[in-house]
């Protein structure tokens, strides 16, 4: 899978949209993970909710929150209040049994506010940034790689 | 007004199959905006959710854990009702069914969901 | 499964009385938890979903609150029609759970 870059203002919100093919993963629950090192484990940060017909529901950990229209196959994370910290590799994963999918892999990056940072430079800042849920652009993207799990009985 | 009939036998012999039905007026078992509920009560058990069923493109159900194996809900969209079969019941199933309709709080990203109409109960008595 | 903890199990008061139902879950639920009423030979009616919102049509009195684990149902002004037993009920598992319920009595 290739990786998706997004950028974000440190202070404002972050909006990640993992998209899916709704009738593959239907009926699967979906998560945001943090990967913790290029090849380590991804840490769960926060999944949908656990009765998927309420897959819709915002569920929150912290200052994350996920929903997911399971008919637009569209799981949709807000990261909150962007810190540095928050910087990292992500993915959005779609759950089955004890099995996660990837269905996207996301690099987020924080960008500090130039009006707090006097050598900020010509650093560029996307208009929409301004918005509450602004602040995203997208370097590049790509289509999810399919990995077929063995059918269920 | 959305309204739930239920019907079915209020004895059943153990070993045998619990078959209730609910038929809804005022609103569609296709609706996505809603899910259907099977919740019983008894004095020993208190309320226990059973199970639900709703369309999202296509039909699917989630049952709670202690009934799983035996449970099946089913929809009937020509009748516009639902109905709940659950296998090998004994003595501890006897209970009053109840059907429910789920429903889901404001649009986007709705807030809540929760039973808000209910069937007027049926009474379940397990015994040979 | 989660399981709901109600408390008191039972209550007397007098009409006019301030009446506050605990709920307690054994592991966080977010906002995931409604109250319902009901009365004998009855089926539960629901007052507040989504542990705060109040269904439409039931009366002002009644009101909730909380988040995580602790949760609240208030009566502030208890009417005679409110004597009945009260129930919380979650859905963040996908086995949604049910509080023993508080039996609400004339004192």
């Known amino acids: 899978l290739n990786t998706t870059v997004l950028q974000g203002m440190a202070g404002q919100s972050l909006r990640v949209s993992c998209t899916y093919d709704a009738l593959k993963h239907w009926g699967r629950r979906k998560a945001w993970c943090r990967q913790l090192g290029e090849e380590g484990p991804c840490q769960r940060v926060v999944s949908t909710h656990g009765v998927w017909l309420l897959a819709f529901l915002k569920k929150r950990n912290g200052s994350t929150v996920i929903a997911d229209d399971t008919l637009a196959g569209t799981v949709t994370i807000t990261l909150k209040n962007l810190q540095a910290g928050d910087a990292g590799l992500y993915q959005c994963q779609s759950l089955r049994g004890r099995e996660a999918e990837v269905l996207q892999k996301v690099l987020v990056e924080v960008l500090e506010d130039p009006l707090d940072d006097q050598d900020a430079g010509d650093l560029w800042v996307p208009e929409e940034s301004s918005s509450f849920e602004g602040a995203q652009v997208e370097h590049s993207t790509s289509r999810n790689q399919e990995t077929s799990f063995p059918p269920t009985s | 007004q959305v309204q739930l009939q239920q019907s079915g036998p209020g004895l059943v012999k153990p070993s045998q199959t619990l078959s209730l039905t609910c038929a809804i007026s005022?609103?569609?078992?296709?609706?996505?905006?809603?899910?259907w509920n099977w919740i019983r009560q008894s004095p020993s058990r208190g309320l226990e959710w059973l199970g639900h069923?709703?369309?999202?493109?296509?039909?699917?159900?989630e049952y709670a854990v202690s009934v799983k194996s035996r449970i099946t809900i089913n929809p009937d969209t020509s009748k516009n009702q639902f109905s709940l079969q659950l296998n090998s019941v004994t003595p501890e199933d006897t209970a009053v069914y109840y059907c429910?309709?789920?429903?889901?709080?404001?649009?986007?990203?709705?807030?809540?969901?929760?039973?808000?109409?209910w069937g007027q109960g049926t009474l379940v008595t397990v015994s040979s | 499964d989660i399981q709901m903890t109600q408390s008191p199990s039972s209550l007397s008061a007098s009409v006019g009385d301030r009446v506050t139902i605990t709920c307690r879950a054994s592991?966080?639920?977010?906002?995931?938890l409604n109250w319902y009423q009901q009365k004998p030979g009855k089926a539960p009616k629901l007052l507040i979903y989504?542990?705060?919102n109040l269904q439409s049509g039931v009366p002002s009195r009644f009101s909730g609150s909380g988040s995580g684990t602790d949760f609240t149902l208030t009566i502030s002004s208890l009417q005679p029609e409110d004597f009945a037993t009260y129930y919380c009920?979650?859905?963040?598992?996908?086995?949604?759970?049910f509080g023993q319920g508080t039996k609400v009595e004339i004192k």
């Open positions: 592991q966080g639920i977010s906002s995931d």
């Open positions: 009920q979650q859905y963040t598992d996908e086995s949604m759970t």
């Open positions: 005022g609103d569609s078992v296709s609706s996505s905006s809603a899910a």
């Open positions: 989504a542990a705060s």
């Open positions: 069923i709703g369309y999202r493109s296509k039909w699917y159900n």
């Open positions: 429910a309709r789920g429903m889901y709080g404001s649009v986007p990203y709705k807030e809540g969901y929760y039973f808000d109409i």
